[in-house]
């Protein structure tokens, strides 16, 4: 038999091989497909069949418009001028392109050494479902689990049994100061049908670094507070994923659960003293706030203490 | 809302001819075949004609072959019966009905038009 | 030709009964199979498509069925607006067929 592809919505003529091209004409089409459960014998007269499987005029069958449930089997058997039989068989695959891949939510640029969501690759009105890839520098990414993880979805459209596809890539960059190049691919897997490529996208790869801008705020402003006062130290860190904060008073750590925040309630003159708060980040050591100086005192009339914080709540240092 | 309406019906002599008219309305019309169905007083449902989407193809029960002609214009969404040599037999509320093939059976119907042959 | 034989032509029943309708084709029409509903003095109305499938707007007391060529209507309540004729149709060849008809009727 002989395999044919044809695109979904666009006409196909099969031909019945040894017809006669006019009639008289001794022909039977019959075809096994998704609108059969058997095989189904055309009349030649035509009929309701018509308007997806027509006899023509020259004995070959015309599919005006082929959908998915034409996926199947066709067979035509004619006798010839000279009485001898003659047999056509065809099996119809159909295929529909989709439009060009996207990559959404691209991301901006990528930390070494940490997992980071490149985006998301989504492919929408395909048949056969087919396959996204991805490429890096042009180069075929494979998934390996670990510094390269892809999630992919697939979903089929209710009504028109279209394809949706998404693959959702993460990477693990090795080292910073690069900039590569990340593409998307969809291909349906059919002979002579090129894959569908996205725009790349160029990310720059930052080395993790010390989190920016660690910070100790502290309430109420200036660190000084009345006996029984309540005082409320929060260490701000611009970190993914947030980091564990531990606490520091005069130069030795707080024996207290990892927290971003330090809440000294009814404060009396033994918590007077500096404090600071450390951040462990898992891909880099240790970092440290500037400290700020806590003042308990029976008037709030002193001006702020040095290493203490100013008008704008920020622990500076001196 | 689909809607299909049928006219054109009256009382008529024995060999005499008329033409039904059905408009359409609420859907592509050039989408679908569209159907002739008849229903003879205190009877049941008979086929009449069929016509593809485009018009080029037609297709009758051997009870009206080459006495009726269904056509259409999908300009004005409009299919048509032409009755000819009608005969006492003939008479029947006449239905417009969207479909005809294997995609649709039918599926929408007009409320019908009554055709009286009689002298 | 197909013939769609429809059986029983009549039958009574009471609101709330089970009503099963049968029409058999003389030979193999796949799933092209209708069911229809028709009221005195009004056009039909299509129940079920393709043998099983409700129509859009028809309560879920109606169902079709399909054994080979054994097509069955079934209401599973019957309720008063029910009660009217109900016509089989086979769309596999020409010419299109109907089945003879089932009059339900209030016993």
């Known amino acids: 038999g002989q395999n044919i592809t044809a695109r979904i919505g666009e006409p196909l003529v099969l031909s019945c091989k040894g017809a006669p091209k006019k009639p008289p004409q001794q022909l039977e089409w019959k075809l096994n497909t998704g609108r059969t459960e058997a095989w189904k014998v055309l009349s030649p007269q035509g009929g309701p069949w018509d308007s997806v499987a027509r006899i023509l005029p020259n004995g070959s069958l015309l599919l005006p418009a082929t959908g998915i449930v034409d996926e199947g089997t066709f067979r035509c058997r004619a006798t010839n001028r000279r009485g001898k039989e003659v047999k056509s068989n065809y099996r119809v695959r159909v295929y529909q392109i989709p439009g060009k891949p996207e990559i959404v939510d691209p991301a901006s640029e990528l930390t070494a050494s940490v997992p980071n969501k490149v985006g998301t690759c989504v492919s929408e009105g395909s048949y056969p479902a087919g396959t996204l890839s991805w490429h890096l520098d042009g180069k075929l990414l494979i998934p390996d689990g670990k510094e390269t993880l892809v999630k992919e979805e697939t979903r089929r459209h209710p009504e028109t049994g279209l394809f949706t596809l998404r693959s959702e890539l993460t990477v693990i960059p090795t080292q910073g100061g690069t900039h590569p190049t990340f593409s998307c691919s969809f291909s349906l897997g059919l002979p002579r049908r090129r894959p569908l490529n996205t725009a790349p996208i160029q990310l720059r790869v930052r080395e993790p670094g010390p989190p920016e801008g660690i910070q100790l705020l502290v309430e109420p402003e200036g660190g000084i507070v009345a006996p029984g006062g309540t005082v409320t130290l929060t260490c701000a860190i611009s970190a993914q994923p947030p980091p564990q904060v531990h606490w520091i008073k005069d130069g030795a750590p707080l024996p207290l659960a990892p927290s971003p925040v330090l809440l000294l309630p009814e404060v009396g003159h033994e918590d007077e003293g500096t404090y600071s708060c450390v951040a462990t980040h898992p891909s880099h050591g240790p970092q440290e706030s500037p400290p700020v100086s806590i003042r308990v005192t029976e008037t709030g009339d002193e001006g702020p203490a040095e290493g203490s914080v100013g008008e704008s709540g920020l622990g500076t240092l001196a | 809302e689909v809607q299909l309406v049928e006219s054109g019906g009256g009382l008529v002599q024995p060999g005499g001819s008329l033409r039904l008219s059905c408009a359409a309305s609420g859907f592509t019309f050039n989408n679908y075949w569209m159907t002739w169905v008849r229903q003879a007083p205190g009877k049941g449902l008979e086929w009449v004609a069929s016509?593809?989407?485009?018009?080029?193809?037609?297709y009758y029960p051997d009870s009206v072959k080459d006495r009726f002609t269904i056509s259409r214009d999908n300009a004005k969404n409009s299919l048509y019966l032409q009755m000819n040599s009608l005969r006492a037999e003939d008479t029947a509320v006449y239905y417009c009905a969207r479909g005809g093939d294997i995609r649709v059976g039918l599926d929408v119907w007009g409320q019908g038009t009554l055709v009286t042959v009689s002298s | 030709d197909i013939q769609m034989t429809q059986s029983p032509s009549s039958l009574s029943a009471s609101v709330g009964d089970r009503v099963t309708i049968t029409c058999r084709a003389s030979q193999d029409v796949g799933i092209y199979v209708n069911w229809f509903q028709q009221k005195p003095g009004k056009a039909p109305r299509r129940l079920i498509y393709?043998?099983?499938n409700l129509a859009d707007g028809v309560p879920s007391r109606f169902s079709g069925s399909r054994s080979g060529t054994d097509f069955t209507l079934t209401i599973s309540s019957l309720q008063p607006e029910d009660f009217a004729t109900y016509y089989c149709l086979e769309f596999d060849e020409h010419p299109l067929t109907f089945g003879g008809g089932t009059k339900v009727e209030i016993k």
């Open positions: 393709r043998a099983t």
């Open positions: 016509i593809d989407n485009s018009g080029d193809n037609t």
